[in-house]
C-alpha cells in the first residue's frame, strides 16, 4: 500500500460498498501523487478501533462515546477531523447536553433527588449517560443495577427503552416506556414534551431541543437551564450552563504515526469534490443503501481538529467524568462536604520542589502535579489531573478561553485589608541600560530583546501588541535582531539570546535561565538591549537584593525606562513612564473546584503567607529567592475577586481586547484547541 493511502475502516457491507465508491471516485479527481483511499472491513466499531491501534487501518468516524473508548489504553487514538453541521459560516461541531426546568420551580442541580425526570431514552447520550453519569455518585447505593438506583433517586421518570417490568418507576411518567416515536415522550422532543406537559420536573435533552420545539421567545422564557454550579440560566445561555459539551461525530487516528495531516488532506479534498451540493454521482454525506454510512447524512463538511487536542480535551472534563463514572462505577467512600486536597500544578523541577515542600507543610491539603510548560499545566487543570495554579494575565486569558475561572488574585501592596481588596494591577515597562543613551521606544528595530515568555503580559502581550499596531505584522523575530522570548520556536532569532542548555534552551520554565521577570532582566544585564518586565523587577534585583553572582553588584541607577512618547525616565518614575497597566497574576481553577480552592488557599495563606516573619526557619508560600516559584515573590496576599470572577471581568475589557488583537500572531496551540471547542 503506498504511503499516501488512508485505510478507512467500514463496519458493515453497506459501509464497505460506500467506501469502495468513495475510493473509486477519489481516484478519478485526485492526482496520482495525492492521497488515496483503501477500505478495511471489520465487524464493529470496537474492532475498527483495535485495527487502527494495531496499524491495520488508519481512520474511522465515531460518536462521542466511542471516541472515549478509542482514547482509552491500549488504543490511544485521538480525534483528527470533526464533522460539522449547520453552515460553513457558523459550523456546529458540538452539541450541549442540558437540564431544562420550568422557571417557577425552585430547585437546583444538587436538589434533583426526589424530583420527576424526563429522559430521551435509556443509554442515550444527552438524555441518560451524561446526566446519570454526572449524578452517579449521588445515587443511592447499591448503584448496580443502575436503573434501580436511578429509579430510587427520582420520585418518578420517563426513560423510554427501559424495562417497565423490572423498573416500573422509570416508566411511571410514560406508561410502557415505548422505545419509538409511538411513545409521545420518546426522544428529544418527547422528553421536552414530558416537562412541558407537567409530567416531569426536569428534562435531559440537547440545547437545540428547546429552540426546535418553541419558536416563540416568550414561550422559551418560561424555561431555564440547571447549571453544574447550582445556579440557573436562561435557555439561550447554554454555552455557559450545560451538563457537557459533546462532539457530534469525529474521525479518529493513532496518536503516534497516525497520518493526521494525510487524513485531513484526503477529507478536505473529498469535501471539495463530493461534499454538500457538489456532485450528483457520489455524495460523501448521503447513504442511498442505509443511514449515516461512513459519515452522518446530516453533516455539511469537515473541520481539522487542532493538533494540541487529545481526546480528553476534545470530549471535555464533564463528558469524560460522566462516562468514566458510568463505566468504572467508582465513587469516594462517602460523599462528604470536606474538600479533597488541591492538586497544584508546578512547572519544572524548581517549582515542583517548592510545591513538595508546601505539600509536606500543608499536612495533606496540597498535592503536587508537574508539567513542563504553563500551557501543559492549564491542560491538566482542564482535564482534572490538576486543580489550580497562579498565572500571569496572558495565561489567565488562555485559561479563561479554555473554560477555567480566576478564583483569587495576587496582591503586591501592603494594606490593612489586603485579602479583601484586589488591586488595579502592576505596570508593564521597557528597561534599558543607562549607558545605551540613544535607545528609545521609537528605534528598537534591530535591537536585542529580552522577554519573560511568549504569551505573558509584561514580557510579551503588551509590548508586542503595541509593536504590532506599529508594524502591522507578526514577524517580531525579524523586527529584533535577536532576543530571548522563552516559548518561541527553537530556530527563531528570539531564542538566540537564551541561555538554557540543550533541550532546555528557550523553554518557558525555570530551566531556562532567562525565563520570567528576573530571567528577562538578567538577559538585559548580560546580553540584551531592552527587557520587557514589570515595574518592580529592577529594584527587586539591584542594590544587593538578589544575592546571585550576576545580580549582587547591580545598581538601579544604571537602568532607565523607555516611555511611549520617545523619552526616557529613571526606574522609579514608572507611574509616568510605562507601556500599560497589567492585571495582577491570579489563581485559576475549574468551575467545579472554585469553592474548595478558594477555601483551602485562604487557610494556607494564613499559615504560610506574609504574616510569617522568619522564612529561614519556616515555610513561606510567597518566597523563592527572586525566582517567582508558584507565586510572584512580591505577593503580599491572595485577594478575593468579589464580582470579577470570570476571565473577562478579571482582566478587563481593554486587556482582553488587546490580547484578542494579538491573537492573529498567537502561536498558542492550546488557545487554538480551546477556541475550536468554543469559538
Amino acid at each position: 500500500v503506498p504511503d499516501k493511502t488512508v485505510r478507512w475502516c467500514a463496519v458493515s457491507e453497506h459501509e464497505a460498498t460506500k467506501c469502495q465508491s468513495f475510493r473509486d471516485h477519489m481516484k478519478s479527481v485526485i492526482p496520482s501523487d495525492g492521497p488515496s483511499v483503501a477500505c478495511v472491513k471489520k465487524a464493529s466499531y470496537l474492532d475498527c478501533i483495535r485495527a487502527i491501534a494495531a496499524n491495520e487501518a488508519d481512520a474511522v468516524t465515531l460518536d462521542a462515546g466511542l471516541v472515549y473508548d478509542a482514547y482509552l489504553a491500549p488504543n490511544n487514538l485521538k480525534p483528527v477531523v470533526a464533522e460539522f453541521y449547520g453552515s460553513k459560516e457558523d459550523p456546529q461541531t458540538f452539541y450541549y447536553a442540558v437540564a431544562v426546568v420550568k422557571k417557577d420551580s425552585g430547585f437546583q442541580m444538587n436538589q434533583l433527588r426526589g424530583k420527576k425526570s424526563c429522559h430521551t431514552g435509556l443509554g442515550r447520550s444527552a438524555g441518560w449517560n451524561i446526566p446519570i453519569g454526572l449524578l452517579y455518585c449521588d445515587l443511592p447505593e447499591p448503584r448496580k443495577p443502575l436503573e434501580k438506583a436511578v429509579a430510587n433517586f427520582f420520585s418518578g421518570s420517563c426513560a423510554p427503552c427501559a424495562d417497565g417490568t423490572d423498573f416500573p418507576q422509570l416508566c411511571q411518567l410514560c406508561p410502557g416506556c415505548g422505545c419509538s416515536t409511538l411513545n409521545q415522550y420518546f426522544g428529544y422532543s418527547g422528553a421536552f414534551k414530558c416537562l412541558k406537559d407537567g409530567a416531569g420536573d426536569v428534562a435531559f435533552v440537547k440545547h437545540s431541543t428547546i429552540f426546535e420545539n418553541l419558536a416563540n421567545k416568550a414561550d422559551r422564557d418560561q424555561y431555564e437551564l440547571l447549571c453544574l454550579d447550582n445556579t440557573r440560566k436562561p435557555v439561550d445561555e447554554y454555552k455557559d450552563c450545560h451538563l457537557a459539551q459533546v462532539p457530534s461525530h469525529t474521525v479518529v487516528a493513532r496518536s503516534m504515526g497516525g497520518k493526521e495531516d494525510l487524513i485531513w488532506e484526503l477529507l478536505n479534498q473529498a469535501q471539495e469534490h463530493f461534499g454538500k451540493d457538489k456532485s450528483k454521482e457520489f455524495q460523501l454525506f448521503s447513504s442511498p443503501h442505509g443511514k449515516d454510512l461512513l459519515f452522518k447524512d446530516s453533516a455539511h463538511g469537515f473541520l481539522k481538529v487542532p493538533p494540541r487536542m487529545d481526546a480528553k480535551m476534545y470530549l471535555g472534563y464533564e463528558y469524560v467524568t460522566a462516562i468514566r463514572n458510568l463505566r468504572e462505577g467508582t465513587c469516594p467512600e462517602a460523599p462528604t462536604d470536606e474538600c479533597k486536597p488541591v492538586k497544584w500544578c508546578a512547572l519544572s523541577h524548581h517549582e515542583r520542589l517548592k510545591c513538595d515542600e508546601w505539600s509536606v507543610n500543608s499536612v495533606g491539603k496540597i498535592e503536587c502535579v508537574s508539567a513542563e510548560t504553563t500551557e501543559d499545566c492549564i491542560a491538566k487543570i482542564m482535564n482534572g489531573e490538576a486543580d489550580a495554579m497562579s498565572l500571569d494575565g496572558g495565561f489567565v486569558y488562555i485559561a479563561g478561553k479554555c473554560g477555567l475561572v480566576p478564583v483569587l488574585a495576587e496582591n503586591y501592596n501592603k494594606s490593612d485589608n489586603c485579602e479583601d481588596t484586589p488591586e488595579a494591577g502592576y505596570f508593564a515597562i521597557a528597561v534599558v541600560k543607562k549607558s545605551a543613551s540613544d535607545l528609545t521606544w521609537d528605534n528598537l528595530k534591530g535591537k536585542k530583546s529580552c522577554h519573560t515568555a511568549v504569551g505573558r503580559t509584561a514580557g510579551w502581550n503588551i509590548p508586542m501588541g503595541l509593536l504590532y499596531n506599529k508594524i502591522n505584522h507578526c514577524r517580531f523575530d525579524e523586527f529584533f535582531s535577536e532576543g530571548c522570548a522563552p516559548g518561541s520556536k527553537k530556530d527563531s532569532s528570539l531564542c538566540k539570546l537564551c541561555m538554557g542548555s540543550g533541550l532546555n534552551l528557550c523553554e518557558p520554565n525555570n530551566k531556562e535561565g532567562y525565563y520570567g521577570y528576573t530571567g528577562a532582566f538578567r538577559c538585559l544585564v548580560e546580553k540584551g538591549d531592552v527587557a520587557f518586565v514589570k515595574h518592580q523587577t529592577v529594584p527587586q534585583n539591584t542594590g544587593g537584593k538578589n544575592p546571585d553572582p550576576w545580580a549582587k553588584n547591580l545598581n538601579e541607577k544604571d537602568y532607565e525606562l523607555l516611555c511611549l512618547d520617545g523619552t526616557r525616565k529613571p526606574v522609579e518614575e514608572y507611574a509616568n513612564c510605562h507601556l500599560a497597566r497589567a492585571p495582577n497574576h491570579a489563581v485559576v481553577t475549574r468551575k467545579d473546584k472554585e469553592a474548595c480552592v478558594h477555601k483551602i488557599l485562604r487557610q494556607q495563606q494564613h499559615l504560610f503567607g506574609s504574616n510569617v516573619t522568619d522564612c529561614s526557619g519556616n515555610f513561606c508560600l510567597f518566597r523563592s529567592e527572586t525566582k517567582d516559584l508558584l507565586f510572584r515573590d512580591d505577593t503580599v496576599c491572595l485577594a478575593k475577586l468579589h464580582d470579577r470572577n470570570t476571565y473577562e471581568k478579571y482582566l478587563g475589557e481593554e486587556y482582553v481586547k488587546a490580547v484578542g488583537n494579538l491573537r492573529k500572531c498567537s502561536t498558542s496551540s492550546l488557545l487554538e484547541a480551546c477556541t475550536f471547542r468554543r469559538p
Epitope: 513538595d356 505539600s359 509536606v360 507543610n361 499536612v363 495533606g364
Partner: nanobody
Framework: EVQLVECGGGLVQAGGSLRLSCVAS????????VIWYRQAPGKQRELVAL???????NYRESVKGRFTISRDDARNTVWLQMNALEPEDTGVYYC??????FGQGTQVTVSS
C-alpha cells in the same frame, strides 16, 4: 512532645560519603513527610531532600543522583545517604517535619 535529633555529620574529603540520621522521639513522626535542609555559613537555609509518607522523594537539582533519602517508620528514623560529596555540600544539616521545631542539626564539612 516530638523532638528531632540529627546525627552522622563530620569532616570528610571531597568524593567521600556520609549517612545522616534523623530520629524522632514520640509518635506520629513524619506522618506528613520529612524534609532535610542545610545552611552554609552566611547563606539562606535551603531544602536538600524530602520524603513523603507514601515514600515519594524529591531532591534539589545539585544533589540529585548523589544523595538518597529513605525512611524507617518502625524506628522513627529518616536517613540521608550522601555520596560523592563536594565542598559546596558543607553546612549544618537539619531535618524537619510539620509542627515540630528545628533541632540542633549536624555539621557536615567537605574538604577539597
Amino acid at each position: 512532645e516530638v523532638q528531632l535529633v540529627e546525627c552522622g555529620g563530620g569532616l570528610v574529603q571531597a568524593g567521600g560519603s556520609l549517612r545522616l540520621s534523623c530520629v524522632a522521639s514520640g509518635s506520629g513522626f513524619g506522618i506528613n513527610g520529612v524534609i532535610w535542609y542545610r545552611q552554609a555559613p552566611g547563606k539562606q537555609r535551603e531544602l536538600v531532600a524530602l520524603i513523603k509518607s507514601d515514600g515519594y522523594t524529591n531532591y534539589r537539582e545539585s544533589v540529585k543522583g548523589r544523595f538518597t533519602i529513605s525512611r524507617d517508620d518502625a524506628r522513627n528514623t529518616v536517613w540521608l545517604q550522601m555520596n560523592a560529596l563536594e565542598p559546596e555540600d558543607t553546612g549544618v544539616y537539619y531535618c524537619k517535619t510539620p509542627g515540630v521545631p528545628f533541632g540542633q542539626g549536624t555539621q557536615v564539612t567537605v574538604s577539597s
